[in-house]
């Protein structure tokens, strides 16, 4: 028997269902009875979800996995992953045996898309060009690390003193933190840039200081 | 016939570990899972886990996950139980169990466990 | 995880009775199991799938029963069923049994 699944990794968003497929050619006369089909873990061999000799033995992971029944005498052997999280993260074996067996894994990765950066401003009164100010840029519940960049008003890359710090909840989603302190000029945008690197998803966010009182774009 | 013949009786200290065997003979010992299950004395069972010899895969119950280690020889068709850090509760009989869809349908004649400072 | 409270948990009867066992589960199963065990032996598969006799088990024992309610009967008591009986299910993880019934006699 002969196991294949999909070579690139399955990308799923939190809390959407993910089906990580393996399929396997049955020969003629091939009945559910003679099948074993073991999902694991591939790091630790750790079971996911099985069926032996014509019966669904049911998720061992967090009641959250199902096969497709009806399609497994066809050698569909997917699974199905149901409100996926980031801890869920990783690779899994699909384990196939009928006479003989055979085995490949694929690839999980779940992504969450970053919410649209807040921008605030200290000081937020009483600006001067020439004075300093720190912007913070912040945005939320994305997974993974993200990638923060700032531009200026003419899209020149602002890279010194930037400090970014991500931290993660407890449902493993990392809230972004970036701080840019600069020396305000006369008029001056500052936009930050919060990248998804797995979903090539960009969240914008800018702030405009035109003299007094400071503006803050509208939403696209 | 299918056979699962275990490792004979042992006593032990606390804070020892424990390996027993299990042996198996008249069937294709790497397409079954096979369990394990204590049994205190006067007390009822209880599932410790199980693994797949074909590919390695096991589950434990949560309970026993930090002291129970399953594993298998396929070249010897003998799966093992190693316990560690074992206390006076340890002390039971611990059986292995093959299982065919979803019954444990043949067991070892058990491996009686004392843990005694 | 899913529990099974067998009752009673002791049964007085004489050979040539009938006997009940129930197995009742906290959460519905598809399937029940049930197993015998006399002192100083393992277990023995009886039933699967509920209703199904192992090989070799006599027609006097039989199971029934769906959802949260299972039972074991046994038509007529012979001197060699005098064990201990347990229900066990494998709907979801970790597999669990019931905390046996005591079948002795009279």
């Known amino acids: 028997v002969e196991v294949q699944v999909s070579e690139d990794p399955v990308v799923a968003l939190v809390d959407t269902d993910a089906t990580l497929r393996c399929s396997f050619s049955p020969e003629p006369g091939f009945s559910l009875a003679q099948l074993n089909l073991i999902w694991q873990l591939t790091d630790t061999k750790q079971l996911v979800h099985s069926f032996t000799e014509g019966r669904d033995q049911g998720s061992a992971y967090s009641n959250r996995t199902a096969l497709f029944p009806d399609l497994l005498v066809q050698g569909n052997a997917s699974l199905r992953l149901q409100r996926v999280r980031v801890t869920d993260e990783g690779s899994y074996t699909c384990f196939v045996s009928i006479q003989d067996f055979d085995s490949a894994a694929v690839s999980l990765q779940v992504a969450a898309p970053y919410s649209k950066p807040s921008m605030t401003l200290e000081p937020n009164k009483d600006l001067r060009p020439g004075n300093m100010v720190t912007i913070t840029c912040s945005s939320y519940q994305g997974y993974p690390e993200a990638e923060v960049f700032w531009k200026d008003g003419q899209g020149v890359p602002l890279t010194g003193n930037v400090t970014t710090s991500q931290m993660a909840n407890e449902r493993g989603l990392f809230d972004v933190h970036s701080v840019l302190r600069v020396v305000l000029g006369a008029n001056g945008t500052y936009s930050c840039l919060v990248r998804n690197p797995v979903l090539q998803q960009d969240a914008h966010g800018s702030v405009t200081i035109t003299g007094q009182p400071l503006t803050f774009p509208p939403e696209a | 016939q299918v056979q699962l013949v275990q490792s004979g009786a042992e006593v032990k200290k606390p804070g020892e570990s424990l390996k027993i065997s299990c042996k198996a003979s008249g069937y294709n010992f790497n397409n079954y899972w096979m369990h394990w299950v204590r049994q205190r004395p006067g007390k009822g069972l209880e599932w410790i886990g199980m693994?797949?010899?074909?590919?390695?895969?096991?589950n434990y119950n949560e309970r026993f996950k930090r002291k129970a280690t399953l594993t298998v020889d396929k070249s010897i068709s003998t799966a093992y139980l190693q316990w560690s850090s074992l206390k006076a509760e340890d002390t039971a009989m611990y059986y292995c169990?093959?299982?065919?869809?979803?019954?444990?349908?043949?067991w070892g004649q058990g491996t009686l466990v004392t843990v005694s400072s | 995880q899913i529990v099974l409270t067998q009752s009673p948990s002791t049964l007085s009867a004489s050979v040539g009775d009938r006997v009940t066992i129930t197995c009742s589960a906290s959460s519905s199963v598809s399937y029940m199991y049930w197993y015998q065990q006399k002192p100083g032996k393992a277990p023995k598969l009886l039933i699967y799938?509920?209703?199904n006799l192992a090989s070799g088990v006599p027609i006097r024992f039989s199971g029934s029963g769906s959802g949260t309610s299972y039972t074991l009967t046994i038509s007529s008591l012979q001197p060699d069923d005098f064990a201990t009986y347990y229900c066990q299910q494998w709907s979801s993880y970790p597999l669990t049994f019931g905390q046996g019934t005591k079948l002795e006699i009279k």
């Open positions: 169990a093959k299982s065919t869809a979803l019954a444990t349908d043949y």
């Open positions: 799938d509920t209703s």
């Open positions: 693994i797949h010899p074909n590919s390695g895969t096991f």
